[in-house]
């Protein structure tokens, strides 16, 4: 049987990807990170 029409079963969340560089002073240079939805993931 063919499927009846329904939307995908999951919701797509559109989030900003923010790259940032943070100066850590005289230690090891800078930390480069990727923030997704407010959480640093890399």
């Amino acid at each position: 049987d063919a499927e009846f029409r329904h939307d995908s079963g999951y919701e797509v969340h559109h989030q900003k990807l923010v790259f940032f560089a943070e100066d850590v002073g005289s230690n090891k240079g800078a930390i480069i990170g990727l923030m997704v939805g407010g959480v640093v993931i890399a």
Epitope: D1, E3, F4, R5, H6, D7, S8, G9, Y10, E11
Partner: antibody
Framework: QVTLKESGPALVKPTQTLTLTCTFS??????????VGWIRQPPGKALEWLAH???????SYNPSLKSRLTISKDTSKNQVVLTMTNMDPVDTATYYC???????????????WGQGTTVTVSS | DVVMTQSPLSLPVTPGEPASISCRSS???????????LEWYLQKPGQSPQLLIY???NRFSGVPDRFSGSGSGTDFTLKISRVEAEDVGVYYC?????????FGQGTKLEIK
């Protein structure tokens, strides 16, 4: 508020074509995800799904009746029309229209129904 | 076509007592999007069907919390925790995952 109302002939003769109109208010068939379908119920029997039409004019039919059914919409009039050809006494039933809306924030079920219109097929 | 089989077909219940209706599908009604589109409708005497439960277990707005739906795969259940006089009518399950959409035969709930 959302309302739907079916209209059409109360009596049709065998072999004739039935034309039913569902006139609705409180929503628009131009809204993304919106759809209206037809369901019938012979006297004292269970419900049977007939057809459905979506806002983008996509249509779905019951395969067992597909050759006899045509569903269409007039968005400007807030109407959905169902035609059924070659009517037979076994098609005697109450015919309902109902709305259904796709979408992750929608119910995606037949949440509002019309009152139904009774059609008798007899010579 | 998917055959929906309800039991019992007749259900006499004493007010205040619980009631349970079974609905079985002849094949899986799991949609490719991961949802199971199993709905319950109540048709009160002389009225149009009205939505009670959608996607197996979600109560429609305004439906009393004494109504609950459960199940998966091919086996589904509608439960009424405490039956009231206004609950009389015919209950239908319907699968809307596959074409054609198919209804059960209906279960007539009556008050003892």
């Amino acid at each position: 508020q959302v309302t739907l109302k079916e209209s059409g002939p109360a009596l049709v003769k065998p072999t004739q074509t039935l034309t039913l109109t569902c006139t609705f208010s409180g929503f628009s068939l131009s809204t993304s995800g919106m759809g209206v379908g037809w369901i019938r119920q012979p006297p004292g029997k269970a419900l049977e799904w007939l057809a459905h039409i979506w806002w983008d004019d996509d249509k779905s039919y019951n395969p067992s009746l597909k050759s006899r059914l045509t569903i269409s919409k007039d968005t400007s009039k807030n109407q959905v029309v169902l035609t059924m050809t070659n009517m037979d006494p076994v098609d005697t039933a109450t015919y309902y229209c109902a709305r259904r809306q796709l979408g992750l924030r929608s119910i995606d079920a037949m949440d509002y129904w019309g009152q139904g219109t009774t059609v008798t097929v007899s010579s | 076509d998917v055959v929906m089989t309800q039991s019992p077909l007749s259900l006499p219940v004493t007010p205040g007592e619980p009631a349970s209706i079974s609905c079985r599908s002849s094949q899986s009604i799991l949609h490719s999007n991961g949802n199971t589109y199993l709905e319950w409708y109540l048709q009160k005497p002389g009225q149009s069907p009205q939505l009670l439960i959608y996607k197996v277990s979600n109560r429609f707005s305004g439906v009393p919390d004494r109504f609950s739906g459960s199940g998966s795969g091919t086996d589904f259940t509608l439960k009424i925790s405490r039956v009231e006089a206004e609950d009389v009518g015919v209950y239908y399950c319907v699968q809307t995952s596959l074409v054609p959409l198919t209804f059960g035969q209906g279960t007539k709930l009556e008050i003892k």
